[in-house]
């Protein structure tokens, strides 16, 4: 008799999930020789152990602690780039500006980027059919808890000037419900972090508005200031030119505002 399976509202586990996690771990350790001490099979076992045989609405940060321990990594605390709703540009930036890091430039972030996963209570099976949706089903699902855990740790590690890239094309440039707004902002350590500098990325070619005056940016400034961290904001009017100037800073056109 086929066993009844819980139907969730979100997409199921990404196909080839175990193979992808293991392969990414191996790639990461090849690309980053300083992480060669990591045993990728153990990393996969710890990742699997966090959600397999557990109810996918009952996952805790504690479940991910063995994985967090194995993936412990030191990144320069003053070279952290946070982002919200503008992942691709943030990653293009750190590809060029090699000394800066997004969460996805760390081992744990790289392993899970763009993947979905969940298991089922009391069975060792991975659910490839459906996984809980954060809004429609539950917030304590394997994917959400993972990102909350790694994002908190990443923000806690930050020091000096922390940068955040924000999407100026969205109605809420700063969204309190995003991972940045709900987790990272509240876990920056005022005794270590001096300034949060927001880079507001413009979408329109002819958009010359000062988006640093947007009400949601003012809200971010207020939250940050209350936490005894200074706040600054810059408009990036031309993201394409911005990236080009990061690549070639000596270019004569790079002295003007971007």
């Amino acid at each position: 008799v086929p066993r009844w399976r819980q139907q969730w509202s979100g997409p199921g586990t990404t196909k080839r999930f175990p193979e992808t996690v293991l392969a990414r771990c191996v790639k990461y350790t090849e690309i980053h020789p300083e992480m060669r001490h990591v045993d990728c099979q153990s990393v996969w076992d710890a990742f699997k152990g966090a959600f397999i045989s557990k109810h996918p609405c009952n996952i805790t940060e504690e479940d991910y602690q063995p994985l967090m321990k194995l993936g412990t990594q030191t990144v320069p605390c003053n070279k952290i780039l946070l982002w919200s709703r503008i992942k691709d540009l943030a990653h293009q930036f750190t590809q060029v500006q090699r000394d800066m890091f997004t969460l996805e430039d760390t081992l744990l972030g790289y392993l899970a980027d763009d993947l979905t996963w969940c298991g089922e209570f009391n069975t060792s099976k991975i659910n490839y059919q459906s996984c809980p949706d954060w809004r429609k089903d539950c917030s304590n699902n394997p994917v959400s808890v993972f990102w909350k855990t790694v994002s908190r740790r990443f923000a806690e590690a930050a020091c000096d000037v922390v940068h955040v890239m924000l999407n100026g094309s969205r109605s809420k440039i700063f969204d309190k419900n995003s991972t940045f707004g709900s987790v990272e902002v509240h876990n920056l350590q005022p005794e270590k972090v001096q300034t949060l500098e927001a880079w507001v990325i413009h979408g329109g070619r002819e958009d010359s508005r000062d988006l640093c005056q947007d009400p949601t940016i003012k809200e971010l400034e207020s939250i940050i200031s209350k936490r005894n961290i200074q706040f600054s904001c810059k408009n990036i009017y031309r993201p394409d030119k911005f990236l080009q100037c990061v690549k070639n800073p000596e270019d004569s056109s790079c002295t003007s505002e971007i």
Partner: antibody, heavy 120, light 107 residues
Framework: QMQLVQSGAEVKKTGSSVKVSCKAS????????MNWVRQAPGQALEWMGW????????DVAQKFQDRVTITRDRSMSTAYMELSSLRSEDTAMYYC?????????????WGQGTTVTVSS | DIQLTQSPSFLSASVGDRVTITCKAS??????VDWYQQKPGKAPKLLIY???NRYTGVPSRFSGSGSGTEFTLTISSLQPEDFATYYC?????????FGGGTKVEIK
């Protein structure tokens, strides 16, 4: 079985560019970093750079920084290495190579090589 | 960049001889050294990875040792098919670097 098949020999003029391809088969292309290594006639091997085919992220040896572009086409499971501003010293055999899980970080898998001859 | 110095550059030996090739790194590379065999017109073949691990299918007469800055490839009893050029490579630090090669010729 696992194969890396490279494009054919090229003869190029000084100052021009060459683009060498490496088509992967027998494994999931995005699961392995692809490296490029070259060897001038009678010389040692020289690592040029890598690409992570999943994201397109690359790293190129300082020596080639301004002249080498490594790209990939995921749909074709193919990696490319383009070398510009060619000079006579770029006459060499160019190889793509990759590692294998559980075999350290050496290259057990190599393409057959592509001969690039640069003439004035 | 890390320099790898291989010695000797040339080596004349007879079938049955024991052959030793050394590779010295300009700084510590732990055990992240691999050895390759290359024959004319062919791609290199991986023999030894992580200093001392024989790759699948490589005959037992090939062995590797060393760690830190000094590494050795030994062929216990040279066979006719072993006449080739041998390279060490370090993968401990980017960029990867290769030794200058050791050509093993028939005496």
């Amino acid at each position: 079985q696992m194969q890396l098949v490279q494009s054919g020999a090229e003869v190029k003029k000084t100052g021009s560019s060459v683009k060498v391809s490496c088509k992967a088969s027998g494994y999931t292309f995005t699961d392995s970093v692809m490296n490029w290594v070259r060897q001038a006639p009678g010389q040692a091997l020289e690592w040029m750079g890598w690409i992570d085919p999943e994201y397109g992220r690359t790293d190129v040896a300082q020596k080639f920084q301004d002249r080498v572009t490594i790209t990939r086409d995921r749909s074709m499971s193919t990696a490319y290495m383009e070398l510009s501003s060619l000079r006579s010293e770029d006459t060499a055999m160019y190889y793509c190579a990759r590692t294998k899980y559980n075999s350290g970080y050496g290259f057990p898998y190599w393409g057959q090589g592509t001969t690039v001859t640069v003439s004035s | 960049d890390i320099q790898l110095t291989q010695s000797p550059s040339f080596l004349s030996a007879s079938v049955g001889d024991r052959v030793t090739i050394t590779c010295k790194a300009s700084q510590n590379v732990d055990s992240d050294v691999d050895w390759y065999q290359q024959k004319p017109g062919k791609a290199p073949k991986l023999l030894i990875y992580k200093a001392s691990n024989r790759y699948t299918g490589v005959p037992s007469r090939f062995s590797g040792s060393g760690s830190g800055t000094e590494f050795t490839l030994t062929i216990s009893s040279l066979q006719p098919e072993d006449f080739a050029t041998y390279y060490c490579m370090q993968s401990n630090t980017h960029p990867r670097t290769f030794g200058g090669g050791t050509k093993v010729e028939i005496k």
